[in-house]
C-alpha cells in the first residue's frame, strides 16, 4: 500500500531513508537536457523474495538532443557526498552493514540523473530527519517519521525535531544536541 502523502517537512531539516521497503518506487528522472530512454522504465521498484531484496528495472537517461547511447555509471568520489558521523548516520551505517529483510538499499546513481530523487513510499516505511547545515537541533525528540495505516488512510507520524540557527545557552550543560553535520544528508531527498 503506497503512502498517500510525502513525509512531513520539518523546518530547516532534511529526511533520509536508511533502507526502502519492498514496494517502494523511485522515479527515473533525468537532469535538464536529458530524458529517459524510450524503452526505459519510468521507475525502479524495490522487489524481493524471502531472502533478498533488490531494485527491479534500471533508470537510463539519454541526451534530449543527440541520440547517443547511455550507460549506468557509479559517480566519481568527488560527486559522492562525504558523510559525517551523526546519530542518524550511525543508524545508516548500521543498516548498510546488516541488510534489513524486506528492504532495498539506496540505489546507486545513474548517469545524468536529476538532482532530486522522487520516491513513492509504502506503509511501514521509516524516514530519519536531521537539521541542515548551519542549523542545530534545539530539541530532538523522536526524529523519524513512519508511514502508518489508520482507519483505512495512510498517515506519517510527526517527527519531534526543532532546528534553530540561534545559539542559546542550555539549562543542562553537556546535554546540548550535537551540531548537524554539514553534509549529513543530501537536500535532494523528497517523495511524491
Amino acid at each position: 500500500e503506497l503512502c498517500d502523502d510525502d513525509p512531513p517537512k520539518i523546518t530547516h531539516a532534511t529526511f533520509k531513508a536508511v533502507a526502502y521497503k519492498e514496494g517502494t518506487m523511485l522515479n527515473c528522472e533525468c537532469k535538464r537536457g536529458f530524458r529517459r530512454i524510450k524503452s526505459g522504465s519510468p521507475y525502479m521498484l524495490c522487489t524481493g523474495n524471502s531472502s533478498h531484496s533488490s531494485w527491479d528495472n534500471q533508470c537510463q537517461c539519454t541526451s534530449s538532443a543527440a541520440r547517443n547511447t547511455t550507460k549506468q555509471v557509479t559517480p566519481q568520489p568527488e560527486e559522492q557526498k562525504e558523510r559525517k558521523t551523526t546519530e542518524m548516520q550511525s543508524q545508516m551505517q548500521l543498516a548498510d552493514q546488516v541488510s534489513l529483510p524486506g528492504h532495498c538499499r539506496e540505489p546507486p546513481p545513474w548517469e545524468n540523473e536529476a538532482t532530486e530523487r522522487i520516491y513513492h513510499f509504502v506503509v511501514g516505511q521509516t524516514v530519519y530527519y536531521q537539521c541542515v547545515q548551519g542549523y542545530r537541533a534545539l530539541h530532538r525528540g523522536p526524529a523519524e517519521s513512519v508511514c502508518k495505516m489508520t482507519h483505512g488512510k495512510t498517515r506519517w507520524t510527526q517527527p519531534q525535531l526543532i532546528c534553530t540557527g540561534e545559539t542559546e545557552p542550555s539549562q543542562f550543560p553537556g546535554e546540548e544536541e550535537p551540531q548537524a553535520s554539514p553534509d549529513g544528508l543530501p537536500e535532494s531527498e523528497t517523495s511524491r
Epitope: 530547516h12 525528540g141 510527526q158 519531534q160 534553530t164 542559546e168 539549562q171 543542562f172 544536541e177
Partner: antibody, heavy 115, light 107 residues
Amino acid sequence: QVQLQQSGAELVRPGVSVKISCKGSGYTFTDYAMHWVKQSHAKSLEWIGVISTYSGDVSYNQKFKGKATMTVDKSSSTAYMELARLTSEDSAIYYCARGVTFDSWGQGTTVTVSS
Amino acid sequence: DIQMTQSPASLSASVGETVTITCRASENSYSYLEWYQQKQGKSPQLLVYNAKTLAEGVPSRFSGSGSGTQFSLKINSLQPEDFGTYYCQHHYGTPYTFGGGTKLEIK
C-alpha cells in the same frame, strides 16, 4: 491520555515576578518540546518561546526576552515560565503547548497584575 | 517576523453551511502552518497541521489547503460544535506568529 496541567490563577502586584508551571503526563515528557503562548484581548495569541524538555535549550521571541524565563524539571515532567517585573500589560492567559505542532495545550493560567 | 493576516475577522453561518477561512502570510511559510479552534473559556485545539494534515480525532468535514503565503481552512456542513474562534499559525522559523483570529458565529 496526554494532559498538560497548569498551575492556578495568579493575582500579583506590579513590579514583582510570577512563576507558572505546566506538568505533562500520559506521554514521554522529554520527547516533546514545550512552547509558551500568551493570550490577551489586545494581541490575540503570541508565541513567547520554546524549551527543549530534554536539554533545557531555549528559543525566545525577541519581544519576550528579559520578560520570560523558561526552565524545565525533567524529574517531575514539569516546564516552568517565570515572568519578571510585571506590569498591567502582562495581564493575560498563559498557555503551555507541546511539540512541533502544538498538538496539546494546557488549560491556561490567568495572570492578573493589579495594585 | 512573518505576519499572519486572517480573513474574515468574523462571520455568521448556519448549521449545514460550508465556510472557508483564509490566512495570508507576509512571507513564504511553505507548508509550515497550523489551524486551531478555540471555544469560549477553553484552550485552543489543533485542527490541521503542516497546512493540510488533519489532527487525530478531527472530523473529516474540516480540511486545510494552501502553501507559500496563501492558506485556507474549509468546514463543510457546519455542526453546532464548530462555532468558536479559529486561528492560523506559522512555524517556519521563529518567532512563530498567529493570525488575529476568525470568530465563527451561529446565524
